[in-house]
Amino acid sequence: KKEDGESTAPTARPKVLRCKCHHHCPEDSVNNICSTDGYCFTMIEEDDSGTPVVTSGCLGLEGSDFQCRDTPIPHQRRSIECCTERNECNKDLHPTLPPLKDRDFVDGPIHHKHHHHHHHHH
């Protein structure tokens, strides 16, 4: 979800934004800081064993509006928050996993990973 009330049509920032990155640092990052023309993000999702894993990093402007919208994915507990208001703003983002639905218990521990939703570096 967006934290700073931006319009849905992404427009180019006049300047580069620096974000903290963790588990999601591109090659051009330095000291766990990445650079982007889009958004900083923090995401929490369950790994294959059901353990919550937090990742953070940069989303390029192109496609980031869709990714930051955090549309629910069947059989996957995941939440993402995005921000642009200052450098490393994602240090202060703390998304939480959505609550378990009854269906999730019935379906068992099979989680369909949809990595293309958040590995969007061009």
Epitope: V16, S29, S35, T36, G60, N87
Partner: antibody
């Protein structure tokens, strides 16, 4: 039009510190980073670091950490670079430059001479 | 740090000639956003550098169309189709993909 005004020259003694200034006009100061670049004769251009005036976030070239400190005064749209423990190696032209994703405007540069 | 290697160091030309300057980087300048942050500047004697080309091939406002940039990855070229007297000076390439940002050592364009 975009202008970055820097004093033309400064003469300082070895071992002292100096604070170079760069006054920006013609644009919204907080909408762009300000970079500082060193140029010594025959040694090309060296990136010192940058500061985002909107949140005073800084990034430095490791080579200049401990040597340069970048600050801003948003009320006067002025960027500053303090250089400490000066030696003859610090004698150079220092440019401030506006940066978004690339430097598009440069100041005229301050020629710093470190001499006793 | 990314090393930017410019060739030639000196480029003697006659007015009206085409000039070509090469810039090679020690690693790819394609940023994780997909942009390539390679830029060209001209520094005339006693002046500060001026932006000519940004992001490989985009001419900055007011820059004549005789200047063009091309390339990708690690290999970039600046071309001046017909050199004029006002084009003389030192040309630098620069990258802002990787911190610390780095510059080429410069190519001096001079009259033959």
């Amino acid at each position: 039009q975009v202008q970055l005004q820097q004093p033309g020259a400064d003469l300082v003694k070895p071992g002292t510190s100096v604070k170079l200034s760069c006054k920006a006009s013609g644009y919204t100061f907080t909408s762009y980073w300000m970079q500082w670049v060193k140029q010594r004769p025959g040694q090309g251009l060296e990136w010192i670091g940058e500061i985002d005036p909107s949140d005073t976030y800084t990034m430095y070239n490791q080579k200049f950490k401990g040597k340069a400190t970048l600050t801003v005064d948003t009320s006067s749209s002025t960027a500053y670079m303090q250089l400490s423990s000066l030696t003859s190696e610090d004698s150079a032209v220092y440019y401030c430059a506006r940066f978004g994703y690339y430097v598009d405007y440069w100041g005229q540069g301050t020629t710093l001479t470190v001499s006793s | 740090d990314v090393v930017m290697t410019q060739t030639p160091l000196s480029l003697p030309v006659s007015l009206g000639d085409q000039a070509s300057i090469s810039c090679r980087s020690s690693q790819s300048l394609v940023h994780s956003t997909g942009n390539t942050y390679l830029h060209w500047y001209l520094q005339k004697a006693g002046q500060s550098p001026k932006l000519l080309i940004y992001k490989v091939s985009n001419r900055f406002s007011g820059v004549p169309d005789r200047f063009s940039g091309s390339g990708s990855g690690t290999d970039f070229t600046l071309k001046i189709s017909r050199v004029e007297a006002e084009d003389l000076g030192v040309y630098f390439c620069s990258q802002s993909t990787h911190v610390p940002f780095t510059f080429g050592s410069g190519t001096k364009l001079e009259i033959k």
